[in-house]
Each structure stands twice: as structure tokens, then as C-alpha cells.
Amino acid sequence: MADGSSDAAREPRPAPAPIRRRSSNYRAYATEPHAKKKSKISASRKLQLKTLLLQIAKQELEREAEERRGEKGRALSTRCQPLELAGLGFAELQDLCRQLHARVDKVDEERYDIEAKVTKNITEIADLTQKIFDLRGKFKRPTLRRVRISADAMMQALLGARAKESLDLRAHLKQVKKEDTEKENREVGDWRKNIDALSGMEGRKKKFES
């Protein structure tokens, strides 16, 4: 399709992949004085975003309030049925009043019991809170300092005993590697020594003597 190709031609070229810089570059960047990097978002855009966020929050609050209203309505509709007085005579209405009064008394009783429980719970919470404050006063918290921690130590702290085996294995591997490199270094060193010995004064001397 012609339209599709022309659209594709108009599209901007994809940005090249970011160049991976050496750490030395970053070190220099950190140490050398440089201008403060300018924020990519303008003040007006920031304000716009803030307004948008507030709007969303407001809508969310309104929705929650509406949900609560609906929930209250549903709760009331299940507890308070619509009055069906049509066809009921004086006798029934009298009895209905008696029934409703009995129900109100029962609900009042339940409310009183619940209030008593709530009061008891509040008192208990207050007591426990006071105890917490008292205990906080007894033990001074040490000032925490930022500690440099190795990856191994962090692993140990996070994984506990399970990490110990893997760490030991890693340590062992490291050890073996170290020994091998040392051996190599020794051999290389000896060979260099021989070359130096032969090329230097001693070599000439040995050659002359021989």
C-alpha cells in the first residue's frame, strides 16, 4: 500500500543505541566541576501533572465516598424494609409498632454491648501504647551508621545458612584460581630470570669464562 510506505518514510529514524562509556569517564564526570543537569520537565508541565494527579485523587475520593453511600444504602435496605401498611388494620399496626419497638430495644441492647466492647478495646490499646512508650524510654536506640558491606556478606545476611554452602564453594573456587595464577607467575618469573642472567653481565662473564 502506497499510503503505508509514505508514512514509514516520514517517521523519524530510531535513536542510536547509547554508547557504553568506561568507568573512568564517569569518575572524571564526578570529580570535575560541571554545570547542574537541567530537568527534562518544565515547571508548567510539572504543575499540569500535579493538577492531573490531584484531579485523579479527587475523583478517587469521590468514588470511594459514593461507594460508601451505596454500601450504607444497601445495608439499610436489608435492615429496614419498606413499610407495607396497605391492607393492614389498626390491630396489625398496633402489633407492628410493638414488634418494631421490641426490635429497637434489641438493637439498642446490642449497640450498648458493642459500645462496651469498643470502650474496653480502646482502653486496652491505650494501655499497650503506654507500655510501648515506657519500654522505648528504657532502651536507647543506637545511632545507625551506613556500613559498606560486601556482596558475600549481604548474601549471608539475606539467605542465612542456606547461602553458607554456596559461599564456601565460591571461596574454594577462588582459592584454586589464586593458586594457579601464583604458580604461573612463579614460572614466568623464573624464565625471565634466566633470560636476564644470560643477557646481562653475568651472561657475558659466563660466556667469556667458557
Epitope: 424494609q81 407495607e84 388494620g89 389498626f90 390491630a91 399496626l93
Partner: antibody, heavy 121, light 107 residues
């Protein structure tokens, strides 16, 4: 024509349970409160239960309170009476009746033919 | 509970007679009184409600009166089809109560 037809009666032992039904027709069932009235073998009439038009409220005499439950299905134009822990004194002809009132006076303006319930050991 | 009592459990009368059946309540029921007729086949019909109001389809030979605790049903010009048992019922207080009924017989 207003009509009520009861069904579900029978013979059972004390302590047993039974559910009576009453099919109503000829009027807007959901607009009326309904009642059950029984007639003892001695021909005494006893009001048993009343239910409001929508079924939210029900009324009973002390003699059946806690044992009998009146209910209704307005979609099916049917009235029910669930009877539990039946006693010999519950033996009677059970009538379904439409309830109405005038200036607060409560009355039953149309009655069914009745359904017989016998409780005997 | 309000007790309803009739002066007589049965009454004998001749066709064409004027018959009065009485009913008394144990307390003032402020005209909340109704009358029913039960035929020998067991069918029950409402005759009078609220002391004196005639139910639809009921013959004008039936009339009701009274106040407070004393009420009555009157049948003028008795006919064969009126031979039945008559009950009064108070609609003032729950439980709704009936009297024991008055059986009307031919002489």
C-alpha cells in the same frame, strides 16, 4: 372472581411438620395482606397468622408463635403456612383468607374452601 | 386477648322472621366488629364489616349495629339460604378473635 384454593393438608403424628399452600386468583394478590384461619373440630374459628402485602411483616397469636411461619410468593400468587412441632390441638380445617381493612377495622373478605389437618398418634 | 361472646349458641326461627344475633366484647372495640356466615358445607363469607358496612354481593336483608362492647346482626325476612352459623370477630387488637358462633335453625 376472587378465589383461594388451599392444598397440602393431611394426617400426621404429633411433633411432625406440614406446609400448606394457597393459590389465589381474581385479584391483584401483591396489593393485599393475607391470613390463615383455622376451625377446630368443635367449630371454633381461630385466627392463625397474617402477612403484609409484600411479605415483610407477619403476625401470629401466642398459641402458634415460633412453630408456624406464614410466607408468600407474590410472583406465583401463592400463600404458605409452614407448621412445625405439630400438636393434637392443631387439628383443624385451615382456611386461607384475603385480608382487608376499613377505617382500621381488620377483616377477612374472601375465604378459601379449607384444607384439613389432623394431628394424631 | 379480647374475648368475644354470643348470648346464645343456637337460635330457632321461621322463614320470613326477623332474627337478631347478639355479640359482646370483653372491652371497647370501637366499632371494629365484623360478621361472617358459614354455610353447612363449610364455606365462609363476610357479611358485615366495621359494625354496619355491608360487604359487596351481600343481601340488604342483613344489617349490623352497635358500639363500645355490644353489637348485633339482624336478618329481616329470613330465607332458607340464611340457615347457617354466624360468627362475630373483633378487628381491634391482635390476636384477632371470634366468638363461638350462633347456629341458626328453622323452627
Amino acid at each position: 372472581e376472587v378465589q383461594m384454593v388451599e392444598s397440602g393438608g393431611g394426617l400426621l403424628k404429633p411433633g411432625g411438620s406440614l406446609k400448606l399452600s394457597c393459590a389465589a386468583s381474581g385479584f391483584t394478590y401483591s396489593n393485599y395482606a393475607m391470613s390463615w384461619v383455622r376451625q377446630t373440630p368443635e367449630k371454633r374459628l381461630e385466627w392463625v397468622a397474617t402477612i403484609s402485602s409484600g411479605g415483610s411483616y407477619s403476625f401470629y397469636p401466642d398459641s402458634v408463635k415460633g412453630r408456624f411461619t406464614i410466607s408468600r410468593d407474590n410472583a406465583k400468587n401463592t400463600l404458605y403456612l409452614q407448621m412445625l412441632s405439630l400438636r393434637s390441638e392443631d387439628t383443624a380445617m385451615y382456611y386461607c383468607a384475603r385480608r382487608d381493612n376499613y377505617f382500621g377495622s381488620t377483616f377477612m373478605d374472601y375465604w378459601g374452601q379449607g384444607s384439613s389437618v389432623t394431628v394424631s398418634s | 386477648d379480647i374475648q368475644m361472646t354470643q348470648t346464645s349458641s343456637s337460635l330457632s326461627a321461621s322463614l320470613g322472621d326477623r332474627v337478631t344475633i347478639s355479640c359482646r366484647a370483653s372491652q371497647d372495640i370501637t366499632n371494629y366488629l365484623n360478621w361472617y356466615q358459614q354455610k353447612p358445607d363449610g364455606t365462609i363469607k363476610l357479611l358485615i364489616y366495621y359494625t354496619s358496612r355491608l360487604h359487596s354481593g351481600v343481601s340488604s336483608r342483613f344489617s349490623g349495629s352497635g358500639s363500645g362492647t355490644d353489637y348485633s346482626l339482624t336478618i329481616s325476612n329470613l330465607e332458607q339460604e340464611d340457615i347457617a352459623t354466624y360468627f362475630c370477630q373483633q378487628g381491634h387488637t391482635i390476636p384477632l378473635t371470634f366468638d363461638t358462633g350462633t347456629k341458626l335453625e328453622l323452627k
